[in-house]
Structure formats: structure tokens, C-alpha cells
């Protein structure tokens, strides 16, 4: 379990627009702590950009993500 | 680089609608919040509150009632509405854009504010 | 609503530490807060120096910390400089809605 004083990324909302997915280096989960879902992916500029993991774009590049791993 | 500018009426009848646009420049709005923050004159700073990317909103319960937040992606903007003004909403109003993600400076870019007085 | 509470002012010498406390009416203040301390320069030019409880924004000097201290989110400056006289405020989520703090005038002299 994480230390209380440990803060969790979470997400206060999505982005809603499909990110290019050549822009994307990694991605993780967020926590079950959250109060809701996430994938935060990481582009290849270090930028985090939180995305709905009920969409299939997001399915899919976590999917592809974990293929070339 | 990142901007945010609010436009606003100046002067305000009580009873009366208030309506400000917040134009952005430098980012989406499709990847980032934006939220409304009032400071009234020598007083701190109120949270009214936040439209997300996909367009849900958050509002101050206090305030629920009579504000409403919209946007429109391709011009940039964000609109503040709120209804039956009184003199105690007289306040410098602010726009601030908020990154999604929990870990990141919540309200990091401010706008300028626009003055709203309400009298008759 | 909750309510957030702040040191109204606090006076600093240049090169010394300053803690800048944010309390909560709720209960202690947690890591789901998401502490953010906001910097209010002469002229309404507000800047979000931290986010998440203890992260600096890009560009903000890391004489600037965030963190819980007890039951209350602090912010600390170490090594205080004269730019640094501010009015600062904190925020804290509570689950849907952000409340701040009254702020606290740090004078630096």
C-alpha cells in the first residue's frame, strides 16, 4: 500500500480528443485509490495527458503498448 | 506560449445576468479544464467553477443555482453565466486553466481578471 | 461547505525559512486534497506554484516546497527572498469542488 503521504495521480477528467498515438512513449494505470478510472499516458515530449479507459482508442494503444513492451 | 484573457461587462444592474468570455491561447481545450475564480475588493479568492475537456462542469454548491459554465473548442472560449446579481458579487473574475491530472498545479496559468461591479 | 483556514500574515527576513500552514474544518488535510498554493503579486498576476500536495509547477524555484505537516498542508520557502513577498493562497479538493484558503501576506523585510 502506498505511504499516506505519498500523493497518487489520478484524474479529474480526460482529454477528448484522440492523441496521435505515434506520440506515445508509455502509459500506466491509475490507481484503484482514485475515485475514478485513468490511463495516463506519457507522450514522447514527457507531457501527461489523462484519457478514459472505457475508449476504444485507449484500449487499443494500452493494448499496443503492452505488445512492444 | 500560454494565455488566457477574460472580457467582461464592467458594470452590472442588481438582478441582472453577468456574461464573460474567457479566450485561451497556447493550449486546447480539448486536453485541459478551465476554471472560474473569484476575488471580491480586499477579500481572498472564491472558486466558482470548472468545465473539463469532454464538457462536464463543477460547480461551488453555494452558487449552483445561478452559474453556468460553457465552452466552444474552435473559437478558444469559455463562457461564464451567472444570474440575479447582487452588490456582493462585485469582484475582479478570473479564468485559470487546469491540467487534468492530480499531480500538476491544479490552476497553473491565470488571466488577467476583468472587473465586475454590480449597481444601479 | 468547507471551510480552509490560513495564517492571515506572516514576516520573514530575507535568507531565512518560512512554513505557510492550510487547515481544513473537515479533518486533516490528506493527499486526496491535492494541496495547490497559488502566489498573488501586486496587480492581480496570479501564478499556481504547487500542485498534488508537493509539486513544484515548471519554472518555480526549489526554494518553494509543498508537503503535510500533521493534519494541516504546509507550504515552505526556504532561503525567503525579497521577490518573494506575496499574498499566497492554498486550495483543497473536496471530491468535486475546490475551496481556498483566505491566504496569507508574507512580507519579506
Known amino acids: 500500500s502506498l505511504a499516506a503521504d505519498t500523493p497518487t495521480a489520478c484524474c479529474f477528467s480526460y482529454t477528448s480528443r484522440q492523441i496521435p498515438q505515434n506520440f506515445i512513449a508509455d502509459y500506466f494505470e491509475t490507481s484503484s485509490q482514485c475515485s475514478k478510472p485513468g490511463v495516463i499516458f506519457l507522450t514522447k515530449r514527457s507531457r501527461q495527458v489523462c484519457a478514459d479507459p472505457s475508449e476504444e482508442w485507449v484500449q487499443k494503444y494500452v493494448s499496443d503498448l503492452e505488445l512492444s513492451a | 506560449q500560454v494565455q488566457l484573457k477574460e472580457s467582461g461587462p464592467g458594470l452590472v444592474a442588481p438582478s441582472q445576468s453577468l456574461s464573460i468570455t474567457c479566450t485561451v491561447s497556447?493550449?486546447?481545450?480539448?486536453?485541459?479544464?478551465i476554471h472560474w475564480v473569484r476575488q471580491p475588493p480586499g477579500k481572498g479568492l472564491e472558486w466558482l467553477g470548472v468545465?473539463?475537456?469532454?464538457?462536464?462542469?463543477n460547480y461551488n454548491s453555494a452558487l449552483m443555482s445561478r452559474l453556468s459554465i460553457s465552452k466552444d473548442n474552435s473559437k478558444s472560449q469559455v463562457f461564464l453565466k451567472m444570474n440575479s446579481l447582487q452588490t456582493d458579487d462585485t469582484a475582479m473574475y478570473y479564468c485559470?486553466?487546469?491540467?487534468?491530472?492530480?499531480?500538476?498545479?491544479?490552476?497553473?496559468?491565470w488571466g488577467q481578471g476583468t472587473s465586475v461591479t454590480v449597481s444601479s | 461547505q468547507a471551510v480552509v483556514t490560513q495564517e492571515s500574515a506572516l514576516t520573514t527576513s530575507p535568507g531565512e525559512t518560512v512554513t505557510l500552514t492550510c487547515r481544513s474544518n473537515?479533518?486533516?488535510?490528506?493527499?486526496?486534497?491535492?494541496a495547490n498554493w497559488v502566489q498573488e503579486k501586486p496587480d492581480h498576476l496570479f501564478t499556481g506554484l504547487i500542485g498534488?500536495?508537493?509539486n513544484r509547477a515548471p519554472g518555480v524555484p526549489a526554494r518553494f516546497s509543498g508537503s503535510l505537516i500533521g493534519d494541516k498542508a504546509a507550504l515552505t520557502i526556504t532561503g525567503a527572498q525579497t521577490e518573494d513577498e506575496a499574498i499566497y493562497f492554498c486550495?483543497?479538493?473536496?471530491?468535486?469542488?475546490?475551496?481556498f484558503g483566505g491566504g496569507t501576506k508574507l512580507t519579506v523585510l
Open positions: 498534488g500536495t508537493n
Open positions: 485559470a486553466r487546469g491540467p487534468l491530472i492530480t499531480t500538476e498545479v491544479s490552476m497553473d496559468y
Open positions: 497556447g493550449f486546447s481545450l480539448t486536453g485541459y479544464g
Open positions: 473537515t479533518g486533516a488535510v490528506t493527499t486526496s486534497n491535492y
Open positions: 486550495a483543497l479538493w473536496y471530491s468535486n469542488h475546490w475551496v
Open positions: 468545465i473539463w475537456p469532454g464538457g462536464g462542469t
